[in-house]
Every structure is written in C-alpha cells, then in structure tokens.
C-alpha cells in the first residue's frame, strides 16, 4: 500500500514484499527490503524512534537508497504497520504484518501495564478498546468488571477488528471500572492488557493564555506561553496553536493534564508553547485552541519581539497638568520600551519617594493636591539592560477656587447697633484671581436660620431669594467700594468692601467670588438690635383656667441674664415699653419668677408659663436683660389681663319662617361666652350636613339654604357649647309650593 502525494520526480519507495498484508508465524525472521530514489527511513510498530535493539536496519549491499529491515524471532507484539518513507516527505509505502503468536494473540504496548479508554455516557457514542490482534480472524469478546459482563460482536454496533480493536457503544461499559479483550484459541483463553474506563464529557468552560497580554521580548530571548483549558470532568482535549512563524525549528509543544483537587467539578489541561530564541519573524498573534470534539474554544495574545532593548516616551505624555486644590492628580508615564524601564520621579530636581500623600511609579499620584505641589516634575526612564536614559518634564499648575478669609473667623451671626454705619468686608484668595466679586442681600425674616434647614456649617442660611445690592429697596442703603489688592500673609488677595449707611433693618449679606475653577461665598448676618421683646403665647388674652406663656426674646449676641419679675400691687403705667429707670434700678422690690430658657441661633427666649391662669395672675410682668458689653440692664413690661369664664349665651332669637320652594333662607345665631363657644346646627335633632344648597359661614354663625326644597322643611336648632355648658335656640321652617323636577337636580 502507498500513502502520500505522488511527486513529479519521485516514485514511491518499493518494498520487496508486494502485499498490503503479510501473515507470518512467531519465532520466524521478518525481513523486508525497501528501495527508492533518495534517502530512506523505516518506521515499525511500538517504536517510532528506531532505538529498538531487536530490529536491525541495514544498507543494502547492492546499491544506493536501499534499506533492509530485519527482525529475528518475531513475536506477536511485532504485529502492525511497517512503513518505508523518504526523509522529510509524506511519500511512503506500508505493509501490515501479522505475527501469529497463538500464545499471545493480543499486541501489548511495550510500556503499558494497563491502558486507558475515555468514554462518554452518551448512547450515541461508541468507544474503541485498542486490543489489536496478532491474528486477523480471532473470536474476541470484551469483558467488563465489576460486576462482570461479557460482550460478544453482534455484527452491528459491537465488533472487533484486528487492526483497530474492540468497538462497543460507550454507555454499555460506562458502569465498569476496567475492561479487557479475551480470545479463545483451541479452548484456551488469552487476555489483553487491562484498560481503565474513564467517562468523558465535552464542555470547555474557558481557555486562558498566560501571559494574557502585553508579551514583549527582544531577539534571542525565550518565549513561553501557557494555554490552560478548564473543562467539565471527564473531558479529553486536543490542543492546537497558531503563530506567525509556523516553520519553527526550535519550537516545543508540551500538553499535559493538570492535577485537580478532589471534589473539584472541573478539570484542567495545559499546553505550553516554547520558542527558545525568538526572532523578529516570531512577532505576531499567538492563538491557542482547545477542542473536545463538540466544543472548541480559543484565546489569543500578541507577542511583540524587539530588535534590541530600548526606551522612549510615548506621544501621549503630558507636559502641562492643571489641577484644583483637593483633587487627586494622576500623571501617567506613557512610554515605549523593552524591557519595562525603571522609573524615577523628581520635583524641582529632588527625588520623590512614595508616602501617604504621594505615590510614585508608572503613575505619579498626588492624593490631595495643594498649592505647594505646584512646580516642575521630571520623570527619568532607564532601560534596565542597555542603561539608556530618557527624561521628560511635566509642569503642574494648581488652581485654587475662591476662598474668603473672614469666613473662618466670623461667628454665624453678628449684631449691629440700630442706626449705625457699618462696613462689611470680603477678602478673597484664589488662583487665578477672581474675575468678579458680587454682593447680594436679603431680609433676615425672609431667611430663617433654623438648624433643621441649615445647608452647611459654613453657610447655615437656606435662602434663595437673594437680591443685588443695587436694589436696596426695603433694606439698608448701601455703597460698594472698588476692589483693592493686598499682599496678606505672603499671598495676593482681593478685598471687596460694602458700606451700610445706616443699620435700620436686619438683613443677610452675601459676597460671591468666582474664578475659572469655582466659586466661594460668605454670608454675613447683619442683625440690627435694640432691647428685648415680650410676646404672649397664645397671643389672645387668656381666660381663667387656660394656660398662657409669657415669652421674653432677646438677641443673644447683645443680651444675657434674662429674668422674669412681677410688679407688686402699686399702680404702673398701662402702656407697653421700657420701664422707667427706678423700676430697673429697684429690682429687689419685684417678685422674681421661675422661668425656662430656650435658645435658637439668634435669640435667647425666657418663657414664664402660667398653667390654669386665675384672676389673681393678672398684673404687670417685667423682663430684664443685661447688655453683654455694657452690662446695662434693659427692662420691658407687659400687662396681663385674665378674662373671667362665662357660660355660653345666644343673643337674639331664631324665628319661625315660611318660604316658597326655590327661594333662599338666611338666618344668624350669635353666641357669646368665655371661652368662646362652638356653634352647631341641627335639623329635626340630626346634625345638619353641608351640601351644595346648605352653606354654613363665620364659624357656623350664619346658615344659608339656597334653592329651598320641600325636604328642607323642619325644626332647626342652633346650639352653642363650651366647657361651661350649652345654650340653644330653635325655629321651624315651613316650605310652600309644589316640587319641580329640574335638570340641575
């Protein structure tokens, strides 16, 4: 038999035995001569390398390009294909030799004590157990264990072929741990080697190359690429590689199974590609493919081969970096080079080392950039092999958003004396300097400073309706001075001033400075203060047995030591206002009262609570506050009247009425009493419910019935009630006329 493509100039090697199959007996000598037209080699079973001691290959004595293969005392194991071929070509002639050894009918692999057969549990798959025969026409069965089962060729799916082995559907032996072939010759049984049964799958989870990317070498270095396929259990894998220089003389491929942990649901296979000394032609894409038969997965990596070690900066390397204070700055080193260079950073010529604020390396990272980080940074790349150096300078400019100096010094609220002239200042530091500073204002009462509404500590005012200072209607008269520039603490700062001609109104003022990287603002609370103030809670005059609170509110930046007193029975002026000096001077004559103090952001409030007020609680109450600076006392008086309790009374009577259908009824029910009574209406002793025709107004005092209907006829009651009892009046309304059905109804 001949294999290979016919060549234009070469005939196939010619064998001395012109047969496809040769059958000889064991212990005889096998001798085959091969003649051809150029250098020849022999390949024979069980030994592909030619190192078998029993086999002799000799040059023929009678001519060139002739070799004789001789095996004395052949054994069954010598059964197989004998191939004579031209070196470095596919042109070959083959003869299959059966060495009939009835004592050893199965060919055993020289090295194997046992074999392995991989199967799937799938019914569609057959498996070949490679128990080849030294005799072509044996009666062979397959034994599987445990439990022991015997399978006999059935002329269909179960068969034995001396050149191939025993073929059987894989599921039939998937239960077995091992199988072997058995031949019967003259009532004697002969067994092949044992084959361990391994059940295989097909699914490949992934194929991973390492190094996975950025593989770089220079000419002459060794390339090692590992390709790992992760599969489900019981998978067999074929690996293949695709690479630029496929005619590689010094390429090595090693495939092996990796040990997996017991209990693992995965199997790993490794294929390693090694090229001992790469050349420029080895540069390119390397692809590894793993295949189980039903699934193929691939992965690729690019291998770059450089002529020699080198280093250079990449085109994307920055020369100017701009940043804002507080930001994280990253200056990546963009370089081209092999092997990767050593990187050193310098600032203004001084080497930089990594610490908690700066990280140096492939990227210079400044965690929180500050003004002092401004400067020139030099990065020097050194090739570790050639020692070639390259340097590059990066200028870092750090911008500062406007910062207003006074912001950190002021308390959230300042107080200003009524009627005085005041100057408000904003001193701004910014890089670059602010391109404008604007002033705005807002009435204090329009922007309550309550902690729950506070936006931030530095700006506790949640106000939004800011007005430009040019529009000072309803506020204080204002003048904005031209900005000035000053060197303060070694920094160039911009100073903006606002002059308030007369402090008449409490307001908030805001200066806002803007530059290219941000804005800064300062809110100034311009609180105009006079003396303390008394209010009543609730603000109506109390009735006896009700509770009332007297609140004394004083600006806490101006006043302290708030105290409540009550005047004795001697008469006092009735008007509200500051008491004459003698009262403030002679506080010993007054009764000091227990009170509770509360504070908000601007005021102290001293609350004196009267629970179940009585007529004896009537009189004049004095709140005393002391000026924080001058220590002068300010006294304010408030007269408290307690009303007597009066049971409800209804003034005037309800009158019976006769009205026609469709007309309107209007009646009033006026009640008095202390506390003021609640008024309710009833019709035929049931609460009157408002609807489109029945309207109650003025705290139920006025009842109107529009478009009167027949069903509105009845007894109407007005009842006035309080905790002291009830009063009521009644009237009967008669409705005349026939009911008309209208569309409106």
């Amino acid at each position: 038999a001949s294999v290979g493509l016919p060549s234009v100039s070469l005939d196939l090697p010619r064998l001395s035995i012109q047969k496809d199959i040769l059958t000889i007996k064991a212990n005889t000598t096998l001798q085959i001569t091969c003649r051809g037209q150029r250098d020849l080699d022999w390949l024979w079973p069980n030994n592909q390398s030619g190192s078998e001691q029993r086999v002799e290959v000799t040059e023929c004595s009678d001519g060139l390009f002739c070799k004789t293969l001789t095996i004395p005392k052949v054994i069954g194991n010598d059964t197989g294909a004998y191939k004579c071929f031209y070196r470095e070509t596919d042109l070959a002639s083959v003869i299959y030799v059966y060495v009939q050894d009835y004592r050893s009918p199965f060919i055993a692999s020289v090295s194997d004590q046992h074999g392995v057969v991989y199967i799937t549990e799938n019914k569609n798959k057959t498996v070949v157990i490679p128990c080849l025969g030294s005799i072509s026409n044996l009666n062979v069965s397959l034994c599987a264990r445990y439990p022991e089962k015997r399978f006999v060729p059935d002329g269909n799916r179960i068969s034995w072929d001396s050149k191939k082995g025993f073929t059987i559907p894989s599921y039939m032996i998937s239960y077995a741990g091992m199988v072997f072939c058995e031949a019967k010759i003259n009532d004697e049984s002969y067994q092949s080697i044992m084959y361990i049964v391994v059940v295989v799958g097909y699914r490949i989870y992934d194929v991973v190359l390492s190094p996975s990317h950025g593989v770089e070498l220079s000419v002459g270095e060794k390339l090692v690429l590992n390709c790992t396929a992760r599969t489900e259990l019981n998978v067999g894998i074929d690996f293949n590689w695709e690479y630029p220089s496929s005619k590689h003389q010094h390429k090595k491929l090693v495939n092996r199974d990796l040990k997996t942990q017991s209990g693992s649901e995965m199997k790993k296979f490794l294929s390693t590609l090694t090229i001992d000394g790469v050349t420029r032609s080895d540069q390119g894409l390397y692809t590894c493919a793993a295949s189980s038969g039903l699934m193929t997965k691939k992965n690729s990596t690019f291998v770059r081969v450089h002529e020699k070690p080198f280093v250079a900066f990449g085109s994307g390397m920055e020369s100017l970096v701009e940043a804002t204070v507080g930001e994280r700055v990253r200056i990546p080193v963009k370089y081209l080079g092999y092997p990767p260079p050593e990187i050193k950073w310098y600032k203004n010529g001084i080497p930089l080392e990594s610490n908690h604020t700066v990280k140096v390396g492939h990227v210079l990272t400044i965690m929180e950039v500050s003004e002092r980080d401004t400067g020139n940074y030099t990065v020097i790349l050194t090739n570790p092999i050639s020692k070639e150096k390259q340097s590059h300078v990066v200028s870092l400019v750090v911008y500062v958003p406007p910062q207003i100096g006074e912001k950190s010094l002021i308390s959230p609220v300042d107080s200003y004396q009524y009627g005085t002239t005041q100057t408000l200042t904003c001193t701004v530091y910014a890089i670059p300097p602010p391109h404008h500073i604007h002033w705005y204002w807002q009435l204090e009462e329009e922007c309550p400073n309550e902690p729950s509404q506070a936006v931030s500590v530095t700006n506790p005012y949640p106000c939004e309706e800011w007005r430009s200072v040019e529009d000072f209607q309803g506020g204080n008269k204002i003048e904005v001075n031209k900005n000035q520039f000053a060197l303060i603490e070694g920094k160039n700062k911009t100073v903006s001033t606002l002059v308030i001609q007369a402090a008449n109104v409490s307001a908030l003022y805001k200066c806002e400075a803007v530059n290219k990287v941000g804005r800064g603002e300062r809110v100034i609370s311009f609180h105009v203060t006079r003396g303390p103030e008394i209010t009543l809670q609730p603000d109506l005059q109390p009735t006896e047995q009700e509770s009332v609170s007297l609140w004394c509110t004083a600006d806490k930046s101006t006043f302290e030591n708030l105290t409540w007193y009550k005047l004795g029975p001697q008469p006092l002026p009735v008007h509200v206002g500051e008491l004459p000096t003698p009262v403030c001077k002679n506080l010993d004559t007054l009764w000091k009262l227990n009170a509770t103090i509360f504070s908000n952001s601007t005021n102290d409030i001293l609350i004196m609570e009267l629970k179940n007020a009585s007529l004896q609680d009537q009189g004049d109450y004095v709140c005393v506050a002391q000026d924080r600076k001058t220590k002068k006392r300010h006294c304010v008086v408030r007269q408290l009247t307690v009303l007597e309790r009066v049971a409800p009374m209804i003034t005037g009577n309800l009158e019976n009425q006769t009205t026609s259908i469709g007309e309107t009824i209007e009646v009033s029910c006026t009640a008095s009493g202390n506390p003021p009574p609640q008024i309710m209406w009833f019709k035929d002793n049931e609460t009157l419910v408002e609807d489109s025709g029945i309207v109650l107004k003025d705290g139920n005092r006025n009842l109107t019935i529009r478009r009167v209907r027949k069903e509105d006829e009845g007894l109407y009651t007005c009842q006035a009630c309080s905790v002291l009892g009830c009063a009521k009046v009644e009237a009967f309304f008669i409705i005349e006329g026939a009911q008309e059905k209208t569309n409106l109804e």
Partner: antibody, heavy 117, light 112 residues
C-alpha cells in the same frame, strides 16, 4: 473570507458507501472543531458528527454510529465523512459546519446524498 | 435526547411589523455555569443556515439589532422588529446543553 465547499454527494444504492469532502479556506482550519449536519427532504436539520481540532475526539448521532466515520486532514484543510451501509433515511443535503464555542458559525452550501434503489 | 419543539408556521406578518417566533425545550437549557445554551439560525430560501443568536440572547457577528432573543429555561422567543423582505425563511432553534445537540423542526416566516 471563510468558505466551506462540500463535494462527493451522489445517488447511491442502499447498503452502498460514499465519502463526502469539505474543503475549507479563509481561516486556520486546524484551529476549529468541525461538524457535519444534514437537512432531510422535509427540511429538518439533524446533527450527524463532530470532530476535534486534532481529530482525536469524534462524536456521532445515534442514527449513524458505527456506519459513518468523520475525519480530517489539517494539512489539506479538508474534512471528510465516510458513509457506509447507507440507508434510504440517510437521503439529505449534507452541510459541513465550522464550530467555535459549540456554535456552528459558518456553513457550506451543502452536497446532496440520495440513497435509492 | 432533549426534544425541541417549534410551530411550523409563524403568524403571517406585514413588512415593518414585529414578529415573535417561539421554541420550547423538553428540558431546561440553563446550564450550571449560569448560561442558557440555546441558538437561533435563519435559513433563507436557497441558502445554508446562518447563526443569528447564541447563548439565548447574544447576537452573532454581523446580525442586525432587529433580532433579539429571550426566554427562560425551557421557553424561548426570537423577536424580529420591523420585518424586512430579507427576513423571510425558516428559523431553527438548537440546544447545546446536552449531547447530542438537537434542532427544532423550524418555523417558516410568512409574509402577508
């Protein structure tokens, strides 16, 4: 451009044999699993056989197991299907298909096998 | 084997409309790796099958975004929006979760 060209289809008597070939071009043949899929006259698609990139692992459908042999010759970018003991139910249009990740991403135009007496 | 069931014909559709083609599997195609191994193919008249969708919802290279796949473990849908003349043909689904890989019987897309 990926191309798969099947050939070898013919009219065969039941019990006969035939070998189909599929010539591949436009890609690295040895880096892909290959399969044969057939389309019956009623337009149903049926997977027939698959082979791993190196040819070590082969899989067959129940209906062809033991009768068909899939093989490949990577050096010649060719896939084969040796069909023996042919039956009338093997009559179909036979496609060769390239496989990656289990998916048949490219198919040939097909070659027709008719099994009839 | 895993059985794949498809309706023989889709509801006739007008150009520009959307159409859904369904496919049912006798067993869940959700594998333990979290992926659903279902593919969709289109066979245009006189041509060989072309892979449209793999892993239930991933479009194959060069496939129009008018095609989208969805489903659960056993019920799957191929949605074609704004149907064009070139969408006419037989649509096959195929399971890859268990060997042997099986195809559905195909659904013919009809145009009104």
């Amino acid at each position: 451009e990926v191309q798969l060209v099947e050939s070898g289809g013919d009219l065969v008597k039941p019990g006969g044999s035939l070998k189909l070939s599929c010539a591949a071009s436009g890609f690295t043949f040895s880096m892909y699993g290959m399969s044969w899929v057939r389309q019956t006259p009623d337009k149903r698609l049926e997977w027939v056989a698959s082979i791993s990139i190196g040819g070590s692992y082969t899989y067959y459908a129940d209906s062809v197991e033991g009768r068909f042999i899939i093989s490949r010759e990577n050096a010649k970018n060719t896939l084969f299907l040796q069909m023996n003991s042919l039956k009338s139910e093997d009559t179909a249009l036979y496609y060769c298909a390239r496989e990656l990740d289990g998916n048949y991403d490219y198919w040939g135009q097909g070659t027709t096998l008719t099994v009839s007496s | 084997h895993i059985m794949i069931t498809q309706d023989e014909l889709s509801n006739p559709v007008t150009f520009g409309e959307s159409v859904s083609i369904s496919c049912r599997s006798s067993k869940s195609l959700l594998y333990k790796d979290g992926k659903t191994y279902l593919n969709w193919f289109l066979q245009r008249p006189g041509q060989s099958p072309q892979l449209l969708i793999y892993l239930m919802s991933t479009r194959a290279s060069g496939v129009s975004d008018r095609f989208s796949g969805s489903g659960s473990g056993t019920d799957f849908t191929l949605e074609i929006s704004r149907v064009k003349a070139e969408d006419v043909g037989i649509y096959y689904c195929q399971q890859l979760v268990e060997y042997p890989f099986t195809f559905g019987s195909g659904t013919k897309l009809e145009i009104k």
